[in-house]
Structures are given as structure tokens and as C-alpha cells.
Interface confidence: low
Amino acid sequence: NQDLPVIKCVLINHKNNDSSVGKSSSYPMVSESPEDLGCALRPQSSGTVYEAAAVEVDVSASITLQVLVDAPGNISCLWVFKHSSLNCQPHFDLQNRGVVSMVILKMTETQAGEYLLFIQSEATNYTILFTVSIRNTLLYTLRRPYFRKMENQDALVCISESVPEPIVEWVLCDSQGESCKEESPAVVKKEEKVLHELFGTDIRCCARNELGRECTRLFTIDLNQTPQTTLPQLFLKVGEPLWIRCKAVHVNHGFGLTWELENKALEEGNYFEMSTYSTNRTMIRILFAFVSSVARNDTGYYTCSSSKHPSQSALVTIVEKGFINATNSSEDYEIDQYEEFCFSVRFKAYPQIRCTWTFSRKSFPCEQKGLDNGYSISKFCNHKHQPGEYIFHAENDDAQFTKMFTLNIRRKPQVLAEASASQASCFSDGYPLPSWTWKKCSDKSPNCTEEITEGVWNRKANRKVFGQWVSSSTLNMSEAIKGFLVKCCAYNSLGTSCETILLNSPGPFPFIQDNIS
């Protein structure tokens, strides 16, 4: 079959840049390097049919399906998708190859399916088949990494059973505390599954794929550090692997480390030791306690002892299911308009939570910080002094937790007024909730001092679910006040605000706002 053309099928993934979306030029976006789709001849098919490797595309992603044809002379082409013919304009590249492209902007379900490209060259006719589907992210998972000992080596393997296959990296830090933050210069990252250097201060393994990034810290007791005020606690679920590292540094090698569970030495096969000399010729020893798959009876106090250091313990708690422990009672706060204030939730959880703060159906990112006592805290300060109901929601694989907060902002009332044929109403949102007075303005009372008491109906505060306290007062129109100006005033401990209304015909006619502090 010597007269068959040499063809190449490629997929070009585009990084969307919003300004170009929706434009129909051939190359509307920044592109990543093309991916070869193979394009093999399909056996046992009538006619010459090439089949490209299946293409999986994320929802809203933009791609180009491209065919490069190395055949003499001109070519003509036609795209067919779901029985509809689509325009096809071949052009030639610098190597004089025919180039045919199909740009799919912002992939949707309707754009998934089989794309057939019919090409006619001077020598022959042939068909190229592309199958494009939307990547099924419902099947995606991202699991927290866990550790295993490498067979016959003093090394740890980091495993994350995730789909798609994650990129695994070790995050190492030799400083203490704050300087081990992710972007600190003290942090070293190694994109590999096996780690041999196990003497660092802080060792974490992270796995990342399309769903995000999950990390697991190697739980460490450092006998050279002052123990935490509260006993460190490590939670695991039944079946998960347990790894605790005990680390100690001494001026010479004359010391040994041992692990005990509830005052009984760990069985051989459940620990291994490594040692090295540091730069200043001191000896560093580490002793790992590990259980490949924990059961309920692995719960208890694990104590690391040394002949030259005070021993330290950690409480390992094996649970059937994950949990989130925090007080879920609602909390109400009352603050001044410029007072600095943050909501905060203190919780204990396993596995680590994902959380959000919500106000008025809008979600805000949630940061969490570990405390020394085994609890974590999440604070929210970005309320911009808007009163209403704030919701903290946290969840992990096994539990969910929601806590409600109400924020009241102490402020002077602000009055809005409206009038109809039969009544005038005033509304105010101040806090504490305002009281109301109505006054009639007349020749006798040009300063509107004549109080109206009849026909006034004050409505109890109506608290909107996401909003703020609103109080209203309604004056029913009587002959005695028709045609007059009336003034409604709302007052609380922070001040008074008034609105003047002309009572003559339907429609709101507020025209003066008095602000009296």
C-alpha cells in the first residue's frame, strides 16, 4: 500500500484565556505541546479508515484535533459530527504538509462524540476517526498518602491510592515551627515515592492530581524537644497503617531507643532503627514504630524511651469512623461598627477537615491552624462588619459539622419610608432595635413636635435568614392627618434618624431625611 499517505493525528490542549473564548480563529489560545494520538489504520474496515487514540477532555477545556497529511498535491476535506457536515479549511505548514484542524472551545457534553474527517487527496480518499469524551471526574479520587517500609531497605515509600495516578512528593524541613511553612526557603521538595533521608525535623508526603493535594505528616516524637503541654494524640481508622518516629540526638553513640505500648515492648517486626552522625559529630538515632494495618487493640500510649533522654509518649486512638468534635451551639456577637473581630471555631477532627465559611449564600475560603493541645482552630475575620448569620461548615470522609454565628453591628438607625393611599410605613435596620415616634408637621407645629399616637402599629423585629434585624412602624391614615407632612423617627442608644412623608395621595413621597445624632 505504497500510495497511502503518511498522516499524524495530534491533540493540542489550550490554556483558556478568557478574552479569546468564543472567537473562531484557528489558534485562539495559548497552547501546550501537542500530544500524538497515534492514528493507526483500522483493520477490517471498508475503505481506508485511520483511528486516533480516544481523547478525554475536562469540562470547559478547549482543544484542537489536528491532522498532518504528508501527501503530494492538494487535499480537500470535510468534518462530520453527529450527522452534520462542518466546514473544513486545510492549509499547509512549512514542511508542506497539509494541516486540518478542528477547534473545540469550552468542551461540553454536547460536543462529545465521534468526529469523522474525510480527506480527499489526488492519490486516494480516506477517513480519520476521533472519539472525544468528557473526562468522568466522578470516578476521580484523591486519597491521603500513607507510608510503607521499603522491602530490605531503610527507606519509606509514600503511597496514595488515587485516580488519576497522583504525583507524589516528599516535603522536608529541618527547622522548627513557622519556618517550615510550605513556601519557606527551609523547605525542600522531592518528587519521588521513596525517601531514604529520614532524619529531618519535619517530614511530609503529599499527593496531587486534578482533585487537589493531600498531605500526611510523619508523626514524630523528638526526645530533645520539650514535650507539648498536652499529650500528643494520633488518630487512625481501623485498617490504616501506623507510623511513629522517635528521634533523639546525643553527643555520642552511647544511647539506645526503645518503644513500648502500654508498658510492653513492641514486638520485633514492629520497629526499625536508623542512625547517622550529624555535621557537628553528634549522633542522631531514629526508631520507627509501625503497624501495617491497625486494629482496635493497637490503641494506647506509645512511649519512646532512651537511656540518655527523658521518655515521651503519644496516645494513639484507633477509631472505626472519622469524626469532627466541636461545640455546635449557635453563638451571637454584638460589636461596634469599627471594632476588630473574628469568628473562631475550635475543633478536633480526624481525618483532617475541609471547611468553608458562608455568609448570605456566599462561600469564603477557610484556613485552619493546629494548636498545641491537639485541637485546630479556624478563624473568619472577613465579615466587613455586615450583620447577619454566618455559617462554618466542615466535613471529612466520615463526618460533617455546622456551626452558626449571628453578628449584630451596633449602629444608629437609618430610616426608609414609603406611603400608600391608606398608610405610611417606615423601616429601620439599626441595632439595638430602635423605638419609633411619629410627629405631625402643621402650622401650629412647624418643627413637627406634635406627637401622633393613634393609628401607629410597630411591628416586632423581623430577622431575615441571612440579613439583619429590621424594625418597622406603620401609621394608618386618618382624616386628621391627610394632606399633612408627618415625620417618623427611629431612635436607639446610638442615635436618631427621621424621615418626612407627605400624606396626600398614593405613592411614596419621602423627601427629607433628618439625621439627628
Epitope: N328, S330, Q400, T402
Partner: antibody
Framework: QVQLVQSGAEVKKPGASVKVSCKAS????????MHWVRQAPGQGLEWMGI????????SYAQKFQGRVTMTRDTSTSTVYMELSSLRSEDTAVYYC??????????????WGQGTLVTVSS | DIQMTQSPSSLSASVGDRVTITCRAS??????LAWYQQKPGKAPKLLIY???SLQSGVPSRFSGSGSGTDFTLTISSLQPEDFATYYC????????FGQGTKVEIK
């Protein structure tokens, strides 16, 4: 143990209002949402609204907006549901029900015994 | 509002039978689904919450499954006290109930 005890049956005329009470005991009243659900004779269950007993904030089903008011009295651990402008199709058993997870995302784990409200001229 | 459609609306079964009731949501509700049992003249009783979690005190013959839009309540071996009406309910948004499935004696 957790108990929700509702007020007795009521017979009302069209246009009138009814106020049903639901007294809670056996748990911390302010830490669980309370819902109201009704069931017309021989019909299914219909959600009416929810109240947060701590802050008193409420959310009502669109259908009942403007006609229903849910309130609570923390001193007596009681929630109330008032339905105004009654019509014959409001004849139903009205239930209060506690939200299982102290958040509006779980199931209703404890229910009152129900209050039959009959609207008839 | 999200519509919940239960099927069948009624079924006849014998003691010891395996019974399956399905509930379909008009849009995805993740796992925010509960199942209730109601007997005549009584308040509903929570059986399953979060689509598959068994409420404490409920016999293990009751189980729930599903996520997104399609959910199932299964009674592995029907007992005399299980003849009742069963409702599903979503709490993903404004709570709504299915129309109910009546389980009767064959």
C-alpha cells in the same frame, strides 16, 4: 430521653389562624434545628419551614411564605407554628420534627405526636 | 424545588421477602437523603440518613444506598412490623419528600 410534645387538636373556621406548640425535652434545646411538616388526610408529607431555636431565625417553604410564622421560647424549650388565613385545604396533621445533626442537612430524628388541625365552616 | 419521585407507589410482599424501594431526585443531591417509615396514625420514624447511614436503634435489615440522583432503600427480609408507608426526603436544598411507597401484605 428526647421528647417532643405537641398541643392538642384544633378546629378552626376559614380565615382564622391556628397556633400549634411543640415542647422539647431531653436534650439541649438551642443546639438542634426544629422543622414543621404537615400531612393532609391520606396524603404525603409536606415541609413547611425551619427555625433555629438559638437565634430564632426562620426559613419557610415558598408555599407558606406570608402565612406561616415560627417562633420559639427558650425559657420553656417550646417552638410554635402559627398559620393564618386558614382554608379548608389546610386541614392536616401538623408535626414538629428535630433535625438529626443540629444542622439543616440531616434527617429528622425525633417527631412530635402530631396535632390535627381541622378547618371547616 | 427539587422533586423526589418514589417507585413503586405501592407494593405487595410477604414476610421474609427482600423489598427494594427507589427514589429519584430531579437534580443531584449528593448524599443528602433520608428514609422514613410511617404507620397509620403515627409520626414518621427516621430509618436512614445521609443516604446510607443507619439511624441508631433501627434494625440492620434496613439499608440505604445511592448518591447524586438515584437512591434505594432495601429491606433484606421483610418482618410483620415493616408493613407501612416509606418516604424519602432530600435536604440538599429546601427539604422535599417523595410521594410515599405503601408496603402491603400479599
Amino acid at each position: 430521653q428526647v421528647q417532643l410534645v405537641q398541643s392538642g387538636a384544633e378546629v378552626k373556621k376559614p380565615g382564622a389562624s391556628v397556633k400549634v406548640s411543640c415542647k422539647a425535652s431531653g436534650y439541649t434545646f438551642t443546639t438542634y434545628y426544629m422543622h414543621w411538616v404537615r400531612q393532609a388526610p391520606g396524603q404525603g408529607l409536606e415541609w413547611m419551614g425551619i427555625i433555629n431555636p438559638s437565634g430564632g431565625s426562620t426559613s419557610y417553604a415558598q408555599k407558606f411564605q406570608g402565612r406561616v410564622t415560627m417562633t420559639r421560647d427558650t425559657s420553656t424549650s417550646t417552638v410554635y407554628m402559627e398559620l393564618s388565613s386558614l382554608r379548608s385545604e389546610d386541614t392536616a396533621v401538623y408535626y414538629c420534627a428535630r433535625d438529626r445533626a443540629a444542622r439543616p442537612r440531616g434527617g429528622f430524628d425525633y417527631w412530635g405526636q402530631g396535632t390535627l388541625v381541622t378547618v371547616s365552616s | 424545588d427539587i422533586q423526589m419521585t418514589q417507585s413503586p407507589s405501592s407494593l405487595s410482599a410477604s414476610v421474609g421477602d427482600r423489598v427494594t424501594i427507589t427514589c429519584r431526585a430531579s437534580q443531584g443531591i449528593r448524599n443528602h437523603l433520608a428514609w422514613y417509615q410511617q404507620k397509620p396514625g403515627k409520626a414518621p420514624k427516621l430509618l436512614i440518613y445521609a443516604a446510607s447511614s443507619l439511624q441508631s436503634g433501627v434494625p440492620s435489615r434496613f439499608s440505604g444506598s445511592g448518591s447524586g440522583t438515584d437512591f434505594t432503600l432495601t429491606i433484606s427480609s421483610l418482618q410483620p412490623e415493616d408493613f407501612a408507608t416509606y418516604y424519602c426526603q432530600q435536604s440538599y436544598s429546601t427539604p422535599t419528600f417523595g410521594q410515599g411507597t405503601k408496603v402491603e401484605i400479599k
